[in-house]
């Protein structure tokens, strides 16, 4: 019961986390105009991974997409890639974890198979969460660097009377959404991994006995098999006590990492 609860909770937490990662990736407020110690303007600027926006005091909002790939900073491209990899891994993890849920019965799937799938999805959630946290942190670091650079240059080039006020950017809401979502996905992944241990049956060393009506001879079958979480175990022995046969390969192929540039 506790295992089912842990697995279910891990799934729900990961689901919320991945939804948050998707939301953060799509949000426009990755960086917002710093209003502190700046002249008050009737225009507010904010930027996302895919476009930059301007909101005027009237409420009029105008967004422009980044219609270039080569012209964008490498760091921004890296952040995009990390977030997309995080979403893809998370989505696959969710798909795998749905079939791994103990409360869902699919054919004659054994607990060992569900344990393997739970572990796989858990690892995927952990990597997904780490990708999101890394992406958001890289962007935040980029912002901090640019903030202090623009602060230093804020009043440069004031040759005469004319001043150019440089727009400084600070952390936007998307960063906090991303950090929290990444953390939730990570926690969900850990919970799935913990649940996996509970799902896997303990190693048994009893001997399965086969009785024959014709004689008194007793045939001993090879001892217990491990409900291992190692990939690729192909156990074809029949277990008398549950009558279930394992003939399918438990091979988990990880998705290849694409370059989103």
């Amino acid at each position: 019961m506790a295992v089912t609860a842990c697995q279910g909770l891990g799934f729900v937490v990961s689901l919320i986390g991945i939804a948050g990662i998707i939301a953060a990736t799509c949000m426009d407020q990755w960086s917002t105009q710093d209003l502190y110690n700046n002249p008050v303007t009737a225009v507010f600027n904010y930027q996302g991974l895919w476009r930059s926006c301007v909101r005027e005091s009237s409420g009029f909002t105008e967004c422009r997409g980044y219609f270039t790939l080569l012209g964008l900073p490498a760091m921004l491209q890296a952040v995009r890639a990390l977030m997309i990899v995080g979403i893809v891994l998370g989505a696959i993890g969710l798909l795998v974890s749905i079939f791994a849920l103990k409360c869902i019965r699919i054919g004659s799937m054994e607990d060992s198979a569900k344990a393997n799938m739970t572990l796989t999805s858990g690892i995927m959630f952990i990597v997904s969460g780490l990708c999101a946290i890394a992406g958001v942190s890289v962007f935040a670091n980029m912002l901090v660097t640019n903030f202090w650079m623009s602060t230093a240059n804020m009043y440069t080039g004031m040759g005469g009377m004319v001043q150019t006020v440089q727009t400084r950017y600070t952390f936007g809401a998307a960063l906090f959404v991303g950090w929290v979502a990444g953390g939730l996905t990570l926690i969900g992944g850990v919970m799935m991994c913990i649940a996996c241990r509970g799902l896997a049956p303990e190693e048994t060393n009893y001997k399965a006995v086969s009785y024959h009506a014709s004689g008194h001879s007793v045939a001993y079958k090879p001892g217990g098999f491990k409900a291992s979480t190692g990939f690729g175990s192909n156990t074809k022995n029949k277990k008398i006590y549950d009558g279930g046969a394992r003939t399918e390969d438990e091979v988990q192929s990880y998705p290849s990492k694409h370059d989103y540039v």
Epitope: N45, E56, S57, S58, R64
Partner: antibody, heavy 118, light 113 residues
């Protein structure tokens, strides 16, 4: 169509408070901002302040301590209060709607002349 | 506060000729986020309230004749009347629409020579 009409006393005594209202029609007060502008006789335009649809207000720094702009949505009216007036506050007072985009004023009232004199 | 300086104070131009009014701001009115200049031009005829001509430095308000055009970026802006008509006699004001408080230039009076 969009209309703005200023109203208020044409004569105000020095040190008193000048109160003007701007009655609007043809647009929603919650969607658009309204600015107040004044023009002393024979002189240029001076921006007094703005109240945006969301309720944010900004004022001319020279008048900030004396001016208040408010809204009464039930009456479709904006109001301007300017305290401790002097002869220098004698002007034609205009209210104008803020355009949606560009922070420009696209519709203006006809203006009302306010004279500060004892 | 932003100081808006208009030049000349007055301008006499023959009918059909080009009229050019300059406006200079003490700070750049260019917003880096959308690359728009928040400068507005108004026309005020005698005994009338001002009328919006141009916003975002170069975008004509609907109904404004195309002989009126705005140009410039940053701190230096120009309003051009390509072919002056009798009805264009008025005072023209530029306005900072970027920084609070919004401020107007002193105005340029356009007359017929």
């Amino acid at each position: 169509q969009v209309q703005l009409q200023e109203s208020g006393p044409g004569l105000v005594k020095p040190s008193e408070t000048l109160s003007l209202t701007c009655t609007v029609s043809g647009f929603s007060l919650t969607d658009y901002g309204v600015s107040w502008i004044r023009q002393p006789p024979g002189k240029g335009l001076e921006w007094i302040g703005v109240m945006w649809g969301g309720g944010n207000t900004y004022y001319n720094s020279a008048l900030k301590s004396r001016v208040t702009i408010s809204v009464d949505t039930s009456k479709n009216q904006f109001s301007l209060k300017l305290s401790s007036v002097t002869a220098a506050d004698t002007a034609v007072y205009y209210c104008a709607r803020q355009r949606y985009g560009g922070n420009a004023m696209d519709y203006w009232g006809q203006g009302t002349l306010v004279t500060v004199s004892s | 506060d932003i100081v808006m300086t208009q030049s000349p104070d007055s301008l006499a131009v023959s009918l059909g000729e080009r009229a050019t009014i300059n406006c200079k701001s003490s700070q750049s009115l260019l917003n880096s986020g959308n690359q728009r200049n928040y400068l507005t031009w108004y026309q005020q005829k005698p005994g009338q309230p001002p009328k919006l001509l141009i916003y975002w430095a170069s975008t004509r308000e609907s109904g404004v004749p195309d002989r009126f055009s705005g140009s410039g970026s940053g701190t230096d802006f120009t309003l051009t009347i390509s072919s002056l008509q009798a009805e264009d006699v008025a005072v023209y004001y530029c306005q900072n629409s970027y920084f609070y408080p919004f401020t107007f230039g002193g105005g340029t009076k356009v007359e017929i020579k």
